[in-house]
Interface confidence: medium
C-alpha cells in the first residue's frame, strides 16, 4: 500500500499493529465499465485445449462460490476433432485473494487468503527431456 | 456465508447494516499448500496462443500490482512457428476481488471491488457467421 499522512476524514484504527486489520465495505463496486464485458463464457468449448468448469462452494469463504477449470484432455484438439498427444493441454492458474471467516462462523471478521485457481486451459508445446 | 448464533469470540460490528462493513486481517494466509505449486510461469511462451504480461500498478488498490495478459497474435502459432489466422488467440478473463482504498488515501479503510483481468490466452476455433 501507499504511506500517506492520515486524512482527517479517515476512520480511526484501534489496531496498534495498524494497518494489519482494516475495515472493508463489502458492497462490491463493479469496475467493469462495459455493461457486457467480453467474457470467456464459450471459450471452454471452442478451445483447442477445452476445459470443464467445476463448482467449488465454501460458506466460510468470500466469495463462497468459485468455478474451477479442469482440462478435458492431456493433449490438444486438432481441426479434425482428434486429440494430438504431441501437444499438452495445461491449466492457466492465477493466485487470487479471497476473504476467509476468522474466527470460523463469525459474520463480520475475515482474514485475507491467497488461493490458486485454474481459470482455463491453453495448448503448449511439451518440454522434451533428451536422455544422453 | 453461514449464519450461526454469534460466537462470543467474534468482533462486534458497529454497522447497523451488518455485516456490510467487516474487519479484515491483511496478514495473508497462503492456502497453496505446496511450497512450489506448478505455476503457469512459462506457458506464456510455449502456448500456441502466446501472451505478454503487462504490469498494472495502482497504489490505491490492494494488491497494488496486477499482471495482465495480452495475446501476442490474432491467430495461433503452428508447429512450424507460423501464425494460423484460421484460428484465434483469445484472452481468458476472470473477475477477481481487490480492495480499493475508500476514502482515497486512507490506510485502513477499503471497499471491495470486482475487476476483470486477463490471465492468459487460449486458441479457439472462430465463430463463422454465414451471410445468406
Amino acid at each position: 500500500g501507499i504511506a500517506i499522512p492520515r486524512n482527517s476524514g479517515c476512520p480511526n484504527s484501534e489496531d496498534k499493529n495498524f494497518p494489519r486489520t482494516v475495515m472493508v465495505n463489502l458492497n462490491i463496486h463493479n469496475r467493469n465499465t462495459s455493461t457486457n464485458p467480453k467474457r470467456s463464457s464459450d471459450y471452454y468449448n471452442r478451445s483447442t485445449s477445452p476445459w470443464n468448469l467445476h463448482r467449488n462452494e465454501d460458506p466460510e469463504r468470500y466469495p463462497s462460490v468459485i468455478w474451477e477449470a479442469k482440462c478435458r484432455h492431456l493433449g490438444c484438439v486438432k481441426a479434425d476433432g482428434n486429440v494430438d498427444y504431441h501437444m499438452n493441454s495445461v491449466p492457466i492458474q492465477q493466485e487470487i485473494l479471497v476473504l476467509r471467516r476468522e474466527p470460523r462462523h463469525c459474520p463480520n471478521s475475515f482474514r485475507l487468503e491467497k488461493i490458486l485457481v485454474s481459470v482455463g486451459c491453453t495448448c503448449v508445446t511439451p518440454i522434451v527431456h533428451h536422455v544422453a | 456465508g453461514i449464519a450461526i448464533p454469534r460466537n462470543s469470540g467474534c468482533p462486534n460490528s458497529e454497522d447497523k447494516n451488518f455485516p456490510r462493513t467487516v474487519m479484515v486481517n491483511l496478514n495473508i494466509h497462503n492456502r497453496n499448500t505446496s511450497t512450489n505449486p506448478k505455476r503457469s510461469s512459462d506457458y506464456y511462451n510455449r502456448s500456441t496462443s502466446p501472451w505478454n504480461l503487462h504490469r498494472n500498478e495502482d497504489p490505491e488498490r490492494y494488491p497494488s500490482v496486477i499482471w495482465e495478459a495480452k495475446c501476442r497474435h490474432l491467430g495461433c502459432v503452428k508447429a512450424d512457428g507460423n501464425v494460423d489466422y484460421h484460428m484465434n488467440s483469445v484472452p481468458i478473463q476472470q473477475e477477481i476481488l481487490v480492495l480499493r482504498r475508500e476514502p482515497r488515501h486512507c490506510p485502513n479503510s477499503f471497499r471491495l471491488e470486482k475487476i476483470l483481468v486477463s490471465v492468459g490466452c487460449t486458441c479457439v476455433t472462430p465463430i463463422v457467421h454465414h451471410v445468406a
Epitope: L26, I28, S64 | A3, K114
Partner: antibody, heavy 123, light 106 residues
C-alpha cells in the same frame, strides 16, 4: 426491481425436446448463478442444475445428465434450459431462480424465482 | 444424495396456534433453507441459512437446528400463513428439497 420472466407453456410429444428461456432484469446478470428447479403436478420441488453466466460453468443433477443443457446469453441476460428425450414424467412446471455469487446483502440462497413454465408431455 | 424428510406432511391448524415443522436430513448438512409456496405461485425464499428471515417475512417465523435436524416455527399462526413449506439443503450434490409440509387453516 429484480425480475425473472420465463417463456410460455409448451406441449410436447414423447421423445421431443423443449427449450425454456428465463430473461433476467433488475440486477447484474453475471453476479448470480441461474439454477433450474422443476415441480411435477401436485409434487415437490426437484433441483435440476446450475449455470454460472460469467464462466459458462454448469453442474447438473446426475438424474438429468445427458438429457439437459443449460446455457446463457449475457448480451440479453437470458438463461436457457433444454431438456431432450422427453417422457410423460417430465410433465412439470420448470422454474429458473437466481443464486448469488457475491456478498453485499445476499442471502446465498435462491432468492428470486421466475413465474414458472408448464411443460406438458403427451402423445 | 441427501434425503430430507419433513414432518408432518399435512397439518390443519387454528389461528394463533404455535406450529413446528421439522426437517430431518439423511446426512449432516451445514445449514438449511426454507421456502414457502402458495397454490399457483412460485416458491418464495422464507428462511435462509437456518435462522435468517428473508426480506418481508413476519417475525412470528423462526428457524433453528444443526447437523441433521432443523425446525421452522410459527409462533402464532395467521390465515396468510396457509401454504406449503419446503426445506432445502445445498451441502452436497444434488441439492435436494423436503417433500413439503402443507399447512391448512381450520
Amino acid at each position: 426491481e429484480v425480475q425473472l420472466v420465463q417463456s410460455g407453456a409448451e406441449v410436447k410429444k414423447p421423445g421431443a425436446s423443449v427449450k425454456v428461456s428465463c430473461k433476467a432484469s433488475g440486477y447484474t446478470f453475471t453476479d448470480y448463478e441461474v439454477h433450474w428447479v422443476r415441480q411435477a403436478p401436485g409434487q415437490g420441488l426437484e433441483w435440476m442444475g446450475v449455470i454460472d453466466p460469467g464462466t459458462g460453468g454448469v453442474a447438473y443433477n446426475q438424474k438429468f445428465e445427458g438429457r439437459v443443457t443449460m446455457t446463457t446469453d449475457t448480451s440479453t441476460s437470458t438463461a436457457y434450459m433444454e431438456l431432450r428425450s422427453l417422457r410423460s414424467d417430465d410433465t412439470a412446471v420448470y422454474y429458473c431462480t437466481r443464486y448469488s455469487l457475491f456478498y453485499g446483502s445476499s442471502p446465498y440462497a435462491m432468492d428470486y424465482w421466475g413465474q414458472g413454465t408448464l411443460v406438458t408431455v403427451s402423445s | 444424495e441427501i434425503v430430507l424428510t419433513q414432518s408432518p406432511d399435512f397439518q390443519s391448524v387454528t389461528p394463533k396456534e404455535k406450529v413446528t415443522i421439522t426437517c430431518s436430513a439423511s446426512s449432516s448438512v451445514n445449514y438449511m433453507h426454507w421456502f414457502q409456496q402458495k397454490p399457483d405461485q412460485s416458491p418464495k425464499l422464507w428462511i435462509y441459512r437456518t435462522s435468517n428471515l428473508a426480506s418481508g417475512v413476519p417475525s412470528r417465523f423462526s428457524g433453528s437446528g444443526s447437523g441433521t435436524d432443523y425446525t421452522l416455527t410459527i409462533n402464532s399462526l395467521e390465515a396468510e400463513d396457509a401454504a406449503t413449506y419446503y426445506c432445502q439443503q445445498r451441502s452436497s450434490y444434488p441439492w435436494t428439497f423436503g417433500q413439503g409440509t402443507k399447512l391448512e387453516i381450520k
